[in-house]
């Protein structure tokens, strides 16, 4: 009898251990991706940033995938998404083509099933970077809480990519899962 | 027999209650620290802000430690870190020496074991605060998801600390644990 | 005997299933509210924004209530609150009343029990939007971790509401529960 009880208890323990592990949200997905400065595109128009580090310095990823410049969701859920984008110019870099700049970031979601791309978050500023100052800097931060489905892709677009600050503490984006979809 | 079963059940309940409590991530650590305006340093270069409130108004801390101007991690994990820094100048505040300002924040991590300090996040802007306007204001927000180990310390550095807005809703930084390290 | 044991196990399983569900923090509350552009107030002074979407596009709400322009907390806890506010002006919109603007956001908490309103977070910038440029843009992001009690209300105030960008990716605020109050 007591042997049987022990077996039952083991079953209970076992199933609950599974549940407990799962309640850790199947190892909650996250990513923190930092700019790969060796491959920043040029131009002043809106361009998609496709080169990001995912496994060096502060960059890391778990239960999400980074492919073709996009952060791919592997697990349905509600995620907090964020991006920090820094722009800078020093007079030693040469003259700016224009002193009036539109420094912007767009965090977009692409659904493969229904091929479509939508902006989740945008931020930025128009700036007047005059020749009277030898150095200019500006940072944008955006963040928000979004429902993401497995297979959806997150990407980052910016204007004036050639002005991006290439430091890992300056230009990055990320996501972490907060909760399941009911 | 049934008494024995009840005892077994109590064991199961007890152990799972512990596990459930633990699954609350040992009372998930967090901190929200607000600027202590009575002790803001001077200087124009990057200075570390060491005076923060942790237990008044919006400021609070749990399962982390605030000591010597640094937020100390007591529990390994992945944390979301954030900072909001406001700068302001009114013509009655004093004799501003320059219109060209670099208003910056740096959130840094210091490891005691391997004495080293690294910037996790930076943000800010160069600003032209002209005498044509009697009041100037600018805020920076940064946030990101980082792996922190017990004993590591988080601190905040800013440029032009004498321009800081001393309100608790203006200048603050914080952290909250999102998940364990696998 | 073994039937009795199975009943006991079912009881254990059942109660633990409840606990597990509850440990999901009673379906963790969240909200992401996007600006309702059909009803943006005018003026340049600080005004409360009362028209937000909660159920279209990126906007969503769960276990919180949106009423009378305020986000109402239904469950005690520690929440991460955030807001992203974009301002813009194009010369085709007509002349600005002044080139010197104070573009600000204030995230406030109102307690009904003790009728009082307090600012949790503020951000923004003074801007010089000169006639030399045909388009101006500026975004603010704020975020922080706060203890909220059931019945408390979160609202958003801005200066110069007529300059708000009405896009859902531009002007929004939100909250998500991170942990219980001990």
């Amino acid at each position: 009898g007591s042997q049987h009880i022990r077996a039952e208890k083991a079953m209970v323990d076992g199933s609950w251990l599974d549940l407990a592990k799962r309640s850790k949200l199947e190892a909650q997905p996250f990513a923190h991706l930092t700019i790969n400065a060796t491959d920043i595109p040029t131009g002043s128009h809106k361009v998609s940033l496709s080169s990001w580090y995912h496994d060096r310095g502060w960059a890391k990823i778990s239960n999400m995938t980074f492919s073709n410049g996009k952060l791919i969701v592997n697990q349905d859920g509600f995620y907090y998404l964020y991006a920090n984008i820094c722009f800078r110019h020093h007079e030693t870099s040469g003259d700016l083509a224009t002193e009036y700049l539109q420094l912007m970031v767009y965090v977009t979601k692409t659904s493969i099933k229904i091929p479509s791309s939508h902006t989740l978050m945008k931020g930025g500023s128009t700036k007047y970077w005059s020749g009277n100052s030898e150095f200019h800097f500006y940072s944008i931060n955006v963040g928000g809480f979004f429902k993401l489905r497995s297979g959806e892709e997150i990407s980052v677009e910016v204007s004036n990519p050639s002005l991006l600050d290439p430091d890992q503490d300056a230009t990055y984006f990320g996501a972490f899962k907060v909760r399941d979809i009911d | 027999g049934s008494q024995h079963i009840r005892a077994e059940k109590a064991m199961v309940d007890g152990s799972w209650l512990d596990l459930a409590k633990r699954s609350k991530l040992e009372a998930q650590p967090f901190a929200h620290l607000t600027i202590n305006a009575t002790d803001i340093p001077t200087g124009s270069h990057k200075v570390s802000l060491s005076s923060w409130y942790h237990d008044r108004g919006w400021a609070k801390i749990s399962n982390m430690t605030f000591s010597n101007g640094k937020l100390i991690v007591n529990q390994d994990g992945f944390y979301y870190l954030y900072a909001n820094i406001c700068f302001r100048h009114h013509e009655t505040s004093g004799d501003l020496a320059t219109e060209y300002l670099q208003l910056m924040v740096y959130v840094t991590k210091t490891s005691i074991k391997i004495p080293s300090s690294h910037t996790l996040m930076k943000g800010g802007s160069t600003k032209y605060w002209s005498g044509n306007s009697e009041f100037h204001f600018y805020s920076i927000n940064v946030g990101g998801f980082f792996k922190l180990r017990s004993g590591e310390e988080i601190s905040v550095e800013v440029s032009n600390p004498s321009l800081l807005d001393p309100d608790q809703d203006a200048t603050y930084f914080g952290a909250f644990k999102v998940r364990d390290i696998d | 005997g073994s039937q009795h044991i199975r009943a006991e196990k079912a009881m254990v399983d059942g109660s633990w299933l409840d606990l597990a569900k509850r440990s999901k923090l009673e379906a963790q509350p969240f909200a992401h509210l996007t600006i309702n552009a059909t009803d943006i107030p005018t003026g340049s002074h600080k005004v409360s924004l009362s028209s937000w979407y909660h159920d279209r596009g990126w906007a969503k709400i769960s276990n919180m209530t949106f009423s009378n322009g305020k986000l109402i907390v239904n469950q005690d806890g520690f929440y991460y609150l955030y807001a992203n506010i974009c301002f813009r002006h194009h010369e085709t919109s007509g002349d600005l009343a002044t080139e010197y603007l104070q573009l600000m956001v204030y995230v406030t908490k109102t307690s009904i029990k003790i009728p009082s309103s307090h600012t949790l977070m503020k951000g923004g910038s003074t801007k010089y939007w000169s006639g030399n440029s045909e388009f101006h843009f500026y975004s603010i992001n704020v975020g922080g971790f706060f203890k909220l009690r059931s019945g408390e209300e979160i609202s958003v105030e801005v200066s110069n509401p007529s300059l708000l960008d009405p896009d859902q990716d531009a002007t929004y605020f939100g909250a998500f529960k991170v942990r219980d109050i001990d």
Epitope: - | D95, A97, T98, L101, Y128, G131, S162 | -
Partner: antibody, heavy 122, light 107 residues
Framework: EVQLVESGGGLVKPGGSLRLSCAAS????????MSWVRQAPGKGLEWVSG????????YYPDTVKGRFTISRDNAKNSLYLQMNSLRAEDTAVYYC???????????????WGKGTTVTVSS | DIQMTQSPSSLSASVGDRVTITCKAS??????IAWYQQKPGKSPKLLIY???YRYTGVPSRFSGSGSGTDFTFTISSLQPEDLATYYC?????????FGGGTKVEIK
Amino acid sequence: EVQLVESGGGLVKPGGSLRLSCAASGFTFRNYAMSWVRQAPGKGLEWVSGISSGGTYTYYPDTVKGRFTISRDNAKNSLYLQMNSLRAEDTAVYYCARRDYGDVYEWYFDVWGKGTTVTVSS
Amino acid sequence: DIQMTQSPSSLSASVGDRVTITCKASQDVRTSIAWYQQKPGKSPKLLIYSASYRYTGVPSRFSGSGSGTDFTFTISSLQPEDLATYYCQQHYSSPWTFGGGTKVEIK
């Protein structure tokens, strides 16, 4: 070599006007706030005006406010002090001084010119 | 305005002596005090700023200390070339004010 050279001093009657100039060289003038500091014969130092690096902020003590005007021309690396309604007590050596980098609200002076003498007498 | 009271107004010391000058502010100026040296017929020269920081190129025998309202300037070993008048200045709040000066003579 970092240098400040004052000029424009001289003898002037009470109620009269004078314009002092300071030529800067050897440093990026536009990056620095500047001041005028005076020293009456056999006396100590007295700050009389300051101007921000871009020239949009000007500061004066009550003793000269409304009578003196500081200005600068960053393109010419030059600082000026227009002195009106001069009084006998304005007699002094006037030094042009560069404000050192430091806290944006704090002014101390790391480079000084040799000075130009202003005498107000009838 | 913040008044700066310097003492003594003059002193005489021998080469190698330790010389101390004090400056008292009429209100708290934290550590916002600068010290200048003015040799006869010359313009002032910055020695110390923020109470204790030596300016670039200033010999190590010159030092400063203090905070709040009471400040000290020290020449650890007086040299013949230190013959000058020394001034303190508060750089805490405008208008920027100077002490009356201390004339240091060599015995």
